[in-house]
């Protein structure tokens, strides 16, 4: 028996369902009584789901997994993982034993889009050209860790005096706070781009300083 999985990682959004594809080629006359299918976490070998002795043995992984029972006899051994969490990320092994056995691993990459950044300024009044200001760009509930880029109004990257911190919450999602310290010119726009490297999703925020009032 030869087991086939997708070479590319499966990307799943947090709180959605994901399908880890796995297939085998049944011989003529194959019956489910011959099939032994085990899904497990590749690294820890923790059992996730199994089908043995002719029946679905069910989920061994927080009751969020399911097979496609009607498709098993056609060689579809895919696993459905419901309500994906950050902690589900990793490699899953699909093991199939009929007369012979084979296995293959498929990677699950979890992702969550970042919120539109909010911009804050400190100080936020009585600003004069030449003042040092702190601009904070905050974006929430994303995964994995973001890449943050700052640019001025002409699109020139600002790399000096940038401090970025990322903190995971109890669900493993990241809140990102990036602080730019800059000396004000006569007027100017400062934009922050928060990029999710897996989703290739960009979230933009900007602040324009033109004397008073400020534009966000």
């Amino acid at each position: 028996v030869e087991v086939q999985v997708s070479e590319d990682p499966v990307v799943a959004l947090v709180d959605t369902d994901a399908t880890l594809r796995c297939s085998f080629s049944p011989e003529p006359g194959f019956s489910l009584a011959q099939l032994n299918l085990i899904w497990q976490l590749t690294d820890t070998k923790q059992l996730v789901h199994s089908f043995t002795e002719g029946r679905d043995q069910g989920s061994a992984y927080s009751n969020r997994t399911a097979l496609f029972p009607d498709l098993l006899v056609q060689g579809n051994a895919s696993l459905r993982l419901q309500r994906v969490r950050v902690t589900d990320e990793g490699s899953y092994t699909c093991f199939v034993s009929i007369q012979d056995f084979d296995s293959a691993a498929v990677s699950l990459q979890v992702a969550a889009p970042y919120s539109k950044p909010s911009m804050t300024l400190e100080p936020n009044k009585d600003l004069r050209p030449g003042n040092m200001v702190t601009i904070t760009c905050s974006s929430y509930q994303g995964y994995p860790e973001a890449e943050v880029f700052w640019k001025d109004g002409q699109g020139v990257p600002l790399t000096g005096n940038v401090t970025t911190s990322q903190m995971a919450n109890e669900r493993g999602l990241f809140d990102v706070h990036s602080v730019l310290r800059v000396v004000l010119g006569a007027n100017g726009t400062y934009s922050c781009l928060v990029r999710n490297p897996v989703l290739q999703q960009d979230a933009h925020g900007s602040v324009t300083i033109t004397g008073q009032p400020l534009t966000f």
Epitope: V1, Q34, N36, K45, T52, T93, F95, F101, D102
Partner: antibody, heavy 119, light 109 residues
Framework: QVQLQQSGAEVKKPGSSVKVSCKAS????????ISWVRQAPGQGLEWMGG????????NYAQKFQGRVTITADESTSTAYMELSSLRSEDTAVYYC????????????WGKGTTVTVSS | EIVLTQSPATLSLSPGERATLSCRAS??????LAWYQQKPGQAPRLLIY???NRATGIPARFSGSGSGTDFTLTISSLEPEDFAVYYC???????????FGQGTRLEIK
Amino acid sequence: QVQLQQSGAEVKKPGSSVKVSCKASGGTFSSYAISWVRQAPGQGLEWMGGIIPILGIANYAQKFQGRVTITADESTSTAYMELSSLRSEDTAVYYCARGGSGSYHMDVWGKGTTVTVSS
Amino acid sequence: EIVLTQSPATLSLSPGERATLSCRASQSVSSYLAWYQQKPGQAPRLLIYDASNRATGIPARFSGSGSGTDFTLTISSLEPEDFAVYYCQQRSNWPPRITFGQGTRLEIK
């Protein structure tokens, strides 16, 4: 070509335990089935249990359940068989054997490890 | 647990003769059956797997047949080096537990 190198002969007291190792060289290890088979003097072959390292799941012959533990270390391509509560009837040659690619039949065998249980 | 019974226990033949060894399972093992040869002081050697497939390097005079509960190992024309003990082996579907027959001793007549 694949070879299975087993640890050396052991002499043990009744009631003690023995741990025999089996190191694979010259081929992949994790995705093959490893079995342990013993043969008492003048007797036939007796399967004790086996493991597929990639799965980490061992299973045992009913007769040895609770007394034998089979493990595999993928990082060193080594399988282990530990037999506890030894008695004189456990005196035998212990073989490790590897299945063919994706198979449970045993196409490569170690040379065997003699375990003698004597007070 | 499936029991394999081999017959005869001992078979006495001369070089050049045909040897037929039998292995009977107490219940169907499909075609999950293998045959091994063992000579004194040596580890067993795989001859046949999946009832009828010759293992790598095994001479064509060895052949296997059968399915379900009745299996046969045939050596078409015995060579002096073929005199040894022969074991059949099966495995259950899941978990993959293995049992051996008690062996057939093939001796020179």
